[in-house]
């Protein structure tokens, strides 16, 4: 199956930069988001610190670490009340991601 230009293969994601023009001059903002073409039963998430299609049940149950969101060799822990997760690097630095 051939993909049209701009079309994503099923089960894959890409990072997209959105430029937003503000009504006020010079207050332009650029936000980066992921564009995913997820298969049925999947939803956009994070795997190995990259956007990825993950099992929708993970999102539903907020078992974020089941996405394997951290880099290899890092430890994953759920935040209190499952509002996100922390990745603990070797040596003890932590990176926290909250889910809005």
């Amino acid at each position: 199956q051939f993909l049209k230009e701009g079309q994503l293969a099923a089960g894959t994601c890409e990072i997209v930069t959105l430029d937003r023009d503000s009504s006020q001059p010079r207050i332009e903002e650029r936000s980066q988001t992921a564009r995913c073409a997820c298969r049925k039963g999947q939803i956009a998430g994070t795997t190995r610190a990259r956007p990825a299609c993950v099992d929708a049940r993970i999102i539903k149950t907020k078992q974020w670490c089941d996405m394997l969101p951290c880099l290899e060799g890092e430890g994953c822990d759920l935040l209190i009340n499952r509002s996100g997760w922390t990745c603990t690097q070797p040596g003890g630095r932590i990176k926290t991601t909250t889910v809005s």
């Epitope: 935040l79 209190i80 690097q89 070797p90 040596g91 003890g92 630095r93 932590i94 990176k95 926290t96």
Partner: antibody, heavy 114, light 113 residues
Framework: QEQLVESGGRLVTPGTTLTLTCTVS????????VSWVRQAPGKGLEWIGY??????PHYASWAKGRFTISKTSSTTVDLKMTSLTTEDTATYFC?????????WGPGTLVTVSS | ELDLTQTPSSVSAAVGGTVTINCQAS????????LAWYQQKPGQPPKLLIY???TLASGVSSRFKGSGSGTQFTLTISDVQCDDAATYYC?????????????FGGGTELEIL
């Protein structure tokens, strides 16, 4: 709103021990790391050390031994500095260290002079 | 010893121009991309512009662009404005288990002509 405020900076004489405190609000120290950074007058930024919950603090090579970072409560992180010299005169900042350091406190000035 | 070399140490630009600042690390940053850029104005704490080498921090103008990986990184400021006059710093993250966790570049002062 996430905020950090440093306190404890003052004029001291060489050889003094001084403890600075970073008080945070709007986020939990159990979920985020904090770094201490200093800036001598007219100079660049210099990283001192980092602490994350449940982990030993980490220090810049030059800061090991004389500087101690500790989490003293659920909202405060201390920086203890011993045997201060005139070279330690600087504004001391604490910052939440996550994906980049953000936000930063306004800083507290430490002046070491005889 | 960990070292981040920033070049140039100072640069001048006209309003509407483009400025490029380079940052070279003595060893690869963590995950090859854990590098941030900050803007600092006199009497103020630094402000995060870019993290993870190229991700724009919240509320930062899209005129600021970060690129690079491993040991070589670049901050590009396009359509320079008077308000951009400041000192810019790069900051690399390294594995805390093997070296200093963080290091800053020496800074680049941007003057607007």
């Amino acid at each position: 709103q996430e905020q950090l405020v440093e306190s404890g900076g003052r004029l001291v004489t060489p050889g003094t021990t001084l403890t600075l405190t970073c008080t945070v609000s709007g986020f939990s120290l159990s979920s985020y790391g904090v770094s201490w950074v200093r800036q001598a007058p007219g100079k660049g930024l210099e990283w001192i050390g980092y602490i994350a919950n449940n982990y030993n603090p980490h220090y810049a090579s030059w800061a090991k031994g004389r500087f101690t970072i500790s989490k003293t409560s659920s909202t405060t992180v201390d920086l203890k500095m011993t045997s201060l010299t005139t070279e330690d005169t600087a504004t001391y900042f604490c910052a939440r260290d996550n994906y980049g350091m953000d936000p930063w406190g306004p800083g507290t000035l430490v002046t070491v002079s005889s | 010893e960990l070292d981040l070399t920033q070049t140039p140490s100072s640069v001048s630009a006209a309003v509407g121009g483009t400025v490029t600042i380079n940052c070279q690390a003595s060893q690869s940053v963590y995950n090859n991309k854990n590098l941030a850029w900050y803007q600092q104005k006199p009497g103020q704490p630094p402000k995060l512009l870019i993290y993870a080498a190229s991700t724009l921090a919240s509320g930062v103008s899209s005129r600021f662009k970060g690129s690079g990986s491993g040991t070589q990184f670049t901050l590009t400021i396009s359509d320079v404005q008077c308000d951009d006059a400041a000192t810019y710093y790069c900051q690399g993250e390294f594995s805390c288990s093997s070296a200093d966790c963080n290091a800053f570049g020496g800074g680049t002062e941007l003057e607007i002509l």
